[in-house]
């Protein structure tokens, strides 16, 4: 069971300092951006991190949304990352959800975050290069020190 708490506005970066944004095709991508680029591309660079109370404490449960014309929420349905046009619900009556991730700091590094899927144990949000694009994907990972599954989250509130 997940119950919605507060939310915060954040900029998410990979460890190469590339900024996460949602492109015109609703794809989550990473790109090099200056601070002014980041501001100019808002709201596509501003993510709403919705925190949830978890009936089985497993880390900070979050849903990640973005508000462009409408609110879209990050989902990992069938292990594929996409933004679905939906508001994060107030309550989720299950211990797993395709839109809930556990945000945890990397041990010894409070500023580096990992996001593990609540639906798929051992699967993490990751940045992966595909041709010329740096994509946000869901990746099964058993080397947890890999930088591709680490991110920084800068609060904008």
């Amino acid at each position: 069971y997940f119950g919605k708490l507060e939310s915060k506005l954040s900029i998410i970066r990979n460890l190469n300092d590339q900024v996460l944004f949602i492109d015109q095709g609703n794809r989550p991508l990473f790109e090099d951006m200056t601070d002014s680029d980041c501001r100019d591309n808002a709201p596509r660079t501003i993510f709403i991190i919705n925190m949830y109370k978890d009936s089985q404490p497993r880390g900070m449960a979050v849903a990640i949304s973005v508000k462009c014309e409408k609110i879209s929420t990050l989902s990992c349905e069938n292990r594929i990352i996409s933004f679905k046009e939906m508001n994060p619900p107030d309550n989720i009556k299950d211990t797993k959800s395709d839109i809930i991730f556990f945000q945890r700091s990397v041990p010894g590094h409070d500023n580096k975050m990992q996001f593990e899927s609540s639906s798929y144990e051992g699967y993490f949000l990751a940045c992966e290069k595909e041709r010329d694009l740096y994509k946000l994907i869901l990746k099964k990972k058993d080397e947890l020190g890999d930088r591709s599954i680490m991110f920084t989250v800068q609060n904008e509130d």
């Epitope: 880390g59 051992g122 099964k140 947890l144 020190g145």
Partner: antibody
């Protein structure tokens, strides 16, 4: 309690191949991997590689990648490690082990080698 | 590859002594470090995971500490059954690498 039971000792000639098996008995959750570790007589532990039973993807240590093949038969819960072009330096005890997530009190994941096979002695001698 | 430098290579101590074994990683391994004990002719057994978390059933005289690149296994009051070999393992990145091992002997 998970147990790993390995095949028996083998004596091989240089240049030959050996295939060691590792059968899981007991209840094991999903989301584990099989790793193989070897230990030459009187020496330390050396990681050889791993296989993911979910998709058969493998990762091998650089020094073994041209000679080792790790496979898994999900229907029998058995993992295999085949090492080819054997030489005398490959004389060692070969262990299979499971690589599984353990969690701390905040749910943070850590992978550990928790269950180990009894080891299989492979002797390479002419 | 991440190198794990373990020291000492051997140690001889008396029952009741405090024994410390260290592992130094060549880069930050984010506490993704486990410690194993191995008795002669047996497979290794997990003692500590996540640098400082005691595996179920392991006596509380064993403890682990460290972060970043420096890690320590401590046996607070040595017992006769603690004789054996001890290894650290970094699980941060492939290839996984073990320390060279420490042979612990009871005087």
């Amino acid at each position: 309690q998970v147990q790993l039971v390995q095949s028996g000792a083998e004596v091989k000639k240089p240049g030959a191949s050996v295939k060691v098996s590792c059968k899981v008995s007991g209840e094991i959750s999903t989301g584990y991997y099989f790793h193989w570790v070897r230990q030459a007589p009187g020496k330390g532990l050396e990681w050889m590689g791993r296989i993911d039973p979910e998709d058969d993807s493998t990762k091998y240590a650089e020094r073994f990648k041209d000679r080792v093949t790790m496979t898994e038969d999900t229907s029998t819960d058995t993992a295999y490690m085949e090492l080819s072009s054997l030489r005398s330096e490959d004389t060692a005890v070969y262990y299979c082990t499971t690589w599984r997530i353990y969690r701390d009190s905040s749910g943070r994941p850590f992978y550990v080698m928790d269950a180990w096979g009894q080891g299989t002695l492979v002797t390479v001698s002419s | 590859d991440i190198q794990m430098t373990q020291s000492p290579s051997s140690v001889s101590a008396s029952v009741g002594d405090r024994v410390t074994i260290t592992c130094l990683a060549s880069e930050d391994i984010y506490t993704y470090l486990t410690w194993y004990q191995q008795k002669p002719g047996k497979a290794p057994q997990l003692l500590i995971y996540g640098a400082n978390k005691l595996q179920d059933g392991v006596p509380s005289r064993f403890s682990g500490s460290g972060s970043g690149t420096d890690y320590t296994l401590t046996i607070s009051s040595l017992q006769p059954e603690d004789e054996g070999d001890y290894y650290c393992l970094q699980g941060s990145k492939f290839p996984l690498t073990f320390g060279q091992g420490t042979k612990l002997e009871i005087k």
